[in-house]
């Protein structure tokens, strides 16, 4: 079924992108984590079969390509003990400047609430700092800084973050010129910031997992996005042209064709990898979508309790994320002692 | 310890509609796809559909769309498969099996077609 | 439909013995999947993803092959072995099995 291999690479580059060789190799080598993927993703058991043959391919290409994959699991693991402090402060002062906000939120254009701005508040980032992030081309018109997405990004975008039509809709429409401005300047320099705690690795966001049950559920809730993405853009007329294509797919054909007799299964190959869980950092990029709409001057008059009400349970998630990220911190500087 | 428990047998007439239930325990109901089998006596086995207890969503073998149809109660932990339009091709064992693999099986619910 | 040819259909081995059975498949599949029924009981899960032993399964079994060709082996024959073995793919739907070969001790 082409859809299906098209979707397949979709997948493989998603992986190669966002997720470690060792969450990766977890993901094959653990029938829990499978099962929980799968489900999390909706897979027809023909996809789920087609996806884990080229993710066994992937692997083993990351695990030659990677020689020291399992150093770099140390490295981040250390980056986050001296970084996690920091975070935890600022993400701690966030959560306190949300819930204040929460009390006199406004509408922020038309009727629009939070649920329109932060596509699916904690799925691997925010939809509208992806629609900046993706490159997403800002420019005026009218006297009015507009978002609108060249057909290619606009695949991309939705391909890969699976946002949903409603925040593409909205990117499109109009803001103020100040408003637009202070998202796409203060998104850009936070992205700048995250780039440099995470180095070259900015895009492996799940290269730092919450836990096998969280990891396993946001890998298979990506894909499932971007499954759905895959199929609405197979449904509008003109999106092939912008369908976004994989340059090197790896695919049940490519990358190892045969089998050998002495070739060590993935199983074998990750046998004796410590993987210790540690939670997302990406999330840490929701709250900065929010302040950019919501700390404006421009809001409208009039408070919706309703957004008040949103913005209360974004608080309140980010502080179960949080306690989530703190409990790892415990056990990693645990392990350390050890 | 995981363990998928099968509706009793069930003897019906031609043209009715009948429904099975699965209820599974020992793991998280959510987190594991569930399968439906046929076999009919002496013979091999048939893939009827899966289905995903955490949102619903269906797949069926193009053969049994519309024929079966496949549900869940999130609370009971119970898989649920409905026939419909019953005829004595339907008379078999029907297995309800768990996850990506089929790695746990209930075991069946034998439906007996006559009139 | 991608139809899955098991042979022998019936093969009776002695205690001891190593035994193979095949299962081709018309088109190339990703996975072979087995399962092992005895008379009267459901179906268990034998090997998975084409070489995996699921828990339990002695490891005088063994499952191997890639495309069309794919074998389920044991090394030594016991009795407990006994039964019908069948064959899956999960490639193409319809998801299908194979006839099944049935095991005897001979």
């Known amino acids: 079924d082409p859809e299906s291999s098209i979707f397949i690479e979709d997948a493989i580059k998603y992986f190669k992108e966002k997720v470690s060789t060792q969450n990766l190799l977890l993901l094959l080598t653990d029938n829990e984590a499978w099962n929980g993927f799968v489900a999390a993703a909706e897979l027809p058991r023909n996809e789920a079969d087609e996806l884990r043959k080229a993710l066994d391919n992937l692997a083993r290409q990351m695990i030659m390509k990677d020689k020291n994959w399992h150093d770099k699991g140390q490295q981040y693991r250390n980056w986050f003990l001296k970084e996690f402090p920091r975070l935890k402060s600022k993400l701690e002062d966030n959560i306190r400047r949300l819930r204040a906000l929460a009390d006199g939120v406004q509408k922020v254009h038309k009727g629009t609430t939070i649920a329109n701005v932060v596509s699916g508040s904690l799925s691997i980032s925010s939809g509208i700092l992806t629609l900046v992030g993706m490159g997403l081309a800002p420019f005026t018109e009218g006297g009015s800084l507009v978002l609108l997405e060249p057909g290619m990004e606009l695949g991309i975008t939705a391909a890969l973050t699976g946002i949903t039509s409603s925040t593409i809709d909205y990117g499109k429409k109009w803001w103020t010129q100040a408003q637009a401005h202070d998202l796409v300047i203060k998104s850009l320099d936070k992205l700048k910031e995250v780039k440099e705690f995470l180095g070259e690795n900015i895009s492996n966001f799940l290269s730092l997992a919450g836990n096998t049950y969280q990891l396993t559920r946001g890998i298979g809730k990506d894909i499932r996005a971007l499954r759905r993405a895959r199929a609405n853009l197979q449904s509008v007329p003109h999106a092939s042209a912008s369908r976004p294509r994989v340059t090197e797919p790896i695919s049940a054909e490519s990358g190892e064709q045969v089998e050998r007799v002495n070739e060590p299964s993935i199983l074998e190959m990750s046998r004796g990898v410590k993987l210790t869980d540690v939670a997302p950092v990406s999330f840490f990029l929701v709250l900065d979508v929010v302040y950019l709409v919501y700390e404006s001057k421009h809001l409208h008059e009039g408070a919706k309790s309703e957004t008040a009400e949103e913005l209360k349970k974004v608080a309140q998630e980010l502080e179960e994320k949080l306690n989530i990220l703190n409990n790892n911190y415990k056990i990693l500087q645990a392990d350390q002692e050890l | 310890q995981v363990q998928l428990q099968q509706s009793g047998p069930e003897l019906v007439k031609p043209g009715a509609s009948v429904k099975m239930s699965c209820k599974a325990s020992?793991?998280?109901?959510?987190?594991?796809?569930i399968s439906w089998v046929k076999q009919r006596t002496g013979q091999g086995l048939e893939w009827i559909g899966e289905?995903?207890?955490?949102?619903?969503?269906?797949y069926y073998t193009e053969k049994f769309r519309g024929k079966a149809t496949l549900t869940a109660d999130k609370s009971s932990n119970t898989a649920y498969m409905q026939l419909s339009s019953l005829t004595s091709e339907d008379s078999a064992v029907y297995f309800c099996?768990?996850?990506?693999?089929?790695?746990?099986w209930g075991q069946g619910t034998t439906l007996t077609v006559s009139s | 439909e991608n139809v899955l040819t098991q042979s022998p259909a019936i093969m009776s081995a002695s205690l001891g013995e190593k035994v193979t059975m095949s299962c081709r498949a018309s088109s190339s599949v990703n996975y072979m999947y087995w399962y092992q029924q005895k008379s009267d009981a459901s179906p268990k899960l034998w090997i998975y993803y084409t070489s995996n032993l699921a828990p339990g399964v002695p490891a005088r079994f063994s499952g191997s092959g890639s495309g069309n060709s794919y074998s389920l082996t044991i090394s030594s024959m016991e009795g407990e072995d006994a039964a019908t073995y069948y064959c899956q793919q999960f490639t193409s739907s319809p998801y299908t099995f194979g006839g099944g070969t049935k095991l005897e001790i001979k």
């Open positions: 289905m995903f207890p955490g949102s619903g969503t269906t």
């Open positions: 020992g793991y998280t109901f959510t987190d594991y796809v």
């Open positions: 099996a768990r996850g990506t693999t089929a790695d746990y």
